[in-house]
Amino acid sequence: KNLKSPQKVEVDIIDDNFILRWNRSDESVGNVTFSFDYQKTGMDNWIKLSGCQNITSTKCNFSSLKLNVYEEIKLRIRAEKENTSSWYEVDSFTPFRKAQIGPPEVHLEAEDKAIVIHISPGTKDSVMWALDGLSFTYSLVIWKNSSGVEERIENIYSRHKIYKLSPETTYCLKVKAALLTSWKIGVYSPVHCIKTTVENELPPPENIEVSVQNQNYVLKWDYTYANMTFQVQWLHAFLKRNPGNHLYKWKQIPDCENVKTTQCVFPQNVFQKGIYLLRVQASDGNNTSFWSEEIKFDTEIQAFLLPPVFNIRSLSDSFHIYIGAPKQSGNTPVIQDYPLIYEIIFWENTSNAERKIIEKKTDVTVPNLKPLTVYCVKARAHTMDEKLNKSSVFSDAVCEKTKPGNTSK
């Protein structure tokens, strides 16, 4: 009896795992084996597919074959007993195009009101994603084990922290990877559950802010209790995308280790130009808080967003304010090549009633003033970037007297 060729061959590629599945064409024939050949683009000869020779089942794995994942290949299969069937050719395919992203590995760390999620690709040093490893983004679904109400979080990186959770509560989540550059969405990880801890008697520090004084950064935060010590750590922000990088490590700011005040001062040269994350932890000697929420710290914006310098031209019923670049020490103007908004506050010298103007322009008119009256003006700059929402401190107040009447022209 002639053997029929196997049919309906499916190629499943997940990360670096290449799996073939097919249907027997004749279930009644026993002791049949199956073998595959493959052919690369531009080749005439067929080569035996290692791992897929004389297979008794209807599934085989050819992951050991070192293929160029961007190169098209063709497969063929036949059945074998005493004789062989004709070859059945599978449509040619490019492994990279066909590949799915496998489930990522997930490690969870519990706090009382937060969970830290560490995500890494499921296949370490994957050949399939070798050129795209740093382009992975992840999305997750999280739910309270007791309620099952799901919340989705999109576009996160290899380390993500979810805040505002309840203590002593079990949360479950699953994560999948995506390669947006290739329009690929991966397979969900298994569900991971973790219980948040009992509430920490010491809350994490809050409202962390960085400002500049002279050649130093001043880092300030709020804390509920007195007689505490604090430590501050920093991390290059870009490393959040790549914890596999050996540089991924939170490091101490030496001048902010075991400080007993809710601020610390350290030289600007501690940080080179760049974007950093900062976090603070409190301790009372026996117990330690969890880490604070991380703040983003851009040396360009946060350090050098100095208060604006301005000149006032006084008229009888208005001021014309001309805003210039702030001066560094040495009287050189600071080049600020990101868009700013200016907040101008003015008041009558004899009154506490302040009025405010917000302007993008660097020449601003303050209208509706009374003649021969002393008004004071102060100004500050804000970045227009929502992600790096930063404000300078206010400039020193400058007070000027308006001119007598009829000088408004």
């Epitope: 760390e109 706090e111 219980k195 008697e201 490590k249 026996n286 330690t288």
Partner: antibody, heavy 123, light 107 residues
Framework: QVQLVQSGAEVKKPGASVKVSCKAS????????MNWVRQAPGQGLEWMGK????????HFNQKFRDRVTLTVDKSTSTVYMELSSLRSEDTAVYYC????????????????WGQGTLVTVSS | DIQMTQSPSSLSASVGDRVTITCKSS??????LAWYQQKPGKAPKLLIY???SLETGVPSRFSGSGSGKDYTLTISSLQPEDFATYYC?????????FGQGTKLEIK
Amino acid sequence: QVQLVQSGAEVKKPGASVKVSCKASGYTFTSYWMNWVRQAPGQGLEWMGKIDPSDSETHFNQKFRDRVTLTVDKSTSTVYMELSSLRSEDTAVYYCARGGRISFDYDGALDYWGQGTLVTVSS
Amino acid sequence: DIQMTQSPSSLSASVGDRVTITCKSSEVIYNRLAWYQQKPGKAPKLLIYGATSLETGVPSRFSGSGSGKDYTLTISSLQPEDFATYYCQQYWNKPFTFGQGTKLEIK
């Protein structure tokens, strides 16, 4: 598979120093803390300190701070623990043990252990 | 330093028994607790981390529970190979500290 292989047993005189090695394989050496734990005969376990193999940052149990030195040789994925000014009560089995990932926010458990090195201090 | 107190310090049981060992910390350790098994002349072996998570390859008869300052290791049905000494360890604050151990013997 992850393996931590320690150097052989040592006999030392009081006042001397001992240096125990721990060679790691089967994982990315610079991604995990390496800890040292000792166990005196018939006694419990005592944590001595840990080192980050990527940059040699160390943390010590205050009890050993003045006498213990932890070092790394990245080229051979080996960590060393040197204990100085030995006394008879330092007779113990010394273990290296892999700790949590350095990139994690908090410390982790000790998931892989070396086979132990017996250090005997006797005059 | 955080003190870890294990109880009992020794325990006799038979194959098939359900066994519970407890560990109390002097401060809250926020589930940063591990359980280890040690057999004579061997290195300790990690069983449980994070108070409740079973280490890969460890039989499911071992389980961990607890929170705050009070933690428990349970062996649901003792097997002959389970007779050993068990240690708890906190890794919340440095120095990391261990309990004094619980020796589990055959009755």
